[in-house]
């Protein structure tokens, strides 16, 4: 039967190190990786294996690795965010946007920057609702419909149908009837769209229309990605 090699060991030509091992280019040996929540305190040599140590507070490693230092957890979630995953030795903190906000600048996991969902002003209704990663799209109310609210969820509603019209409706106001029994083509009352649903898909940010409430542009410098923790092999 084949001998089981204990780390560190010299790999055979054309072979790779085993699962949870890496090839140390200095030692020229296959050596043990450190488990999630740990990092390499000392790299292996020809005669001694990798020495692993636990990540310090506010740092983590998520994968089997041989990084000399654990990665720093992201900064605390801002007031427009909620912490959906806490920082532990094995995982980074994940911040997501609170209800009524969407992610304007995402990162590998969670959101870097949240922005408030656009509110459609009177005369405009929601054409496409906001999601976790895309803003609301507004559209002008078509003839026969109106919206008299500033809202990120209200769509254009049909005017009530009057026997006798006192004041005709327009895009931002319902018709006013003189008769006592107006009818509608839809059930009365405001129609609300559901709050943003959870989605991982990325949507193209629509260009703000002159008809919408003012929206702030957000810009942040993009820092370098954290070092890869995966091993490579033949």
């Amino acid at each position: 039967p084949a001998q089981v090699a204990f780390t560190p060991y010299a790999p055979e030509p054309g072979s790779t190190c085993r699962l949870r091992e890496y090839y140390d280019q200095t030692a020229q040996m296959c050596c043990s990786k450190c488990s999630p929540g740990q990092h390499a305190k000392a790299f292996c040599t020809k005669t001694s294996d990798t020495v692993c140590d636990s990540c310090e507070d506010s740092t983590y490693t998520q994968l089997w690795n041989w990084v000399p230092e654990c990665l720093s957890c992201g900064s605390r979630c801002s007031s427009d965010q909620v912490e959906t995953q806490a920082c532990t030795r094995e995982q980074n903190r994940i911040c997501t946007c609170r209800p009524g906000w969407y992610c304007a600048l995402s990162k590998q996991e969670g959101c870097r920057l949240c922005a408030p969902l656009r509110k459609c002003r009177p005369g405009f209704g929601v054409a496409r609702p906001g999601t976790e990663t895309s803003d609301v799209v507004c559209k002008p109310c078509a003839p026969g419909t109106f919206s008299n609210t500033t809202s990120s969820t209200d769509i254009c509603r049909p005017h009530q149908i009057c026997n006798v019209v006192a004041i005709p409706g327009n895009a931002s106001m319902d018709a006013v009837c003189t008769s006592t029994s107006p009818t509608r083509s839809m059930a009365p009352g405001a129609v609300h769209l559901p709050q943003p649903v959870s989605t991982r898909s990325q949507h193209t940010q629509p260009t703000p229309e002159p008809s919408t409430a003012p929206s702030t542009s957000f810009l942040l410098p993009m820092g370098p990605s954290p070092p890869a923790e995966g091993s490579t092999g033949d």
Epitope: P8, Y9, Q25, T26, Q28, T232, D234
Partner: antibody
Framework: QIQLVQSGPELKKPGETVKISCKAS????????MSWVKQAPGKGLKWMGW????????TYADDFKGRFAFSLETSASTAYLQINNLKNEDTATYFC????????WGQGTLVTVSA | DIVLTQSPASLAVSLGQRATISCRAS??????????MHWYQQKAGQSFKLLIY???NLESGIPARFSGSGSRTDFTLTINPVEADDVATYYC?????????FGGGTKLEIK
Amino acid sequence: QIQLVQSGPELKKPGETVKISCKASGYTFTTFGMSWVKQAPGKGLKWMGWINTYSGVPTYADDFKGRFAFSLETSASTAYLQINNLKNEDTATYFCARRSNFAYWGQGTLVTVSA
Amino acid sequence: DIVLTQSPASLAVSLGQRATISCRASESVDSSGNSFMHWYQQKAGQSFKLLIYRASNLESGIPARFSGSGSRTDFTLTINPVEADDVATYYCQQSNEDPWTFGGGTKLEIK
């Protein structure tokens, strides 16, 4: 199979610079370091040092500190040796060799330095 | 640095006979149960071919006429029987510690 293909011969004047390439194939380039070895006419083999292909950090043997530089183009699986301010004694064949305790070698690049 | 002394510098052997090349290290090249000594063949105007790695392991595709032995400081490359195609210079190399060092080479000729 594992192959290291080096650039062609170079004829240079003293004081000039030469850059030799070594393109690797048949394995994951960033797994194994790349060493450089000098073979001067009528002389023995001298290990010049190596470059870590994962981190990009070079290590130079004592006799090759200063005018010599190792570099990488990882996306092209290629290692480079640059020699600045060439001298007559740099005339030699230079080999790249995969650093996996034993070595797989390139075919060599002859550099001739002559006025 | 580990100094490798190779002997003889040249060797003339009849076809079908045994050729033995020695390599002595100034200090042990053993670590973790391995001897980090390797043997290469260089034919005239060509590059190096790995024959034996870690003292006694035959590289894939190399004929079994080539064998290696030894540990710590004393190593031997044996070619038996020698063929005409074996005319070349043979080098030992250690990789137990940096800098890698090489023997001075042994030139094998046919008698």
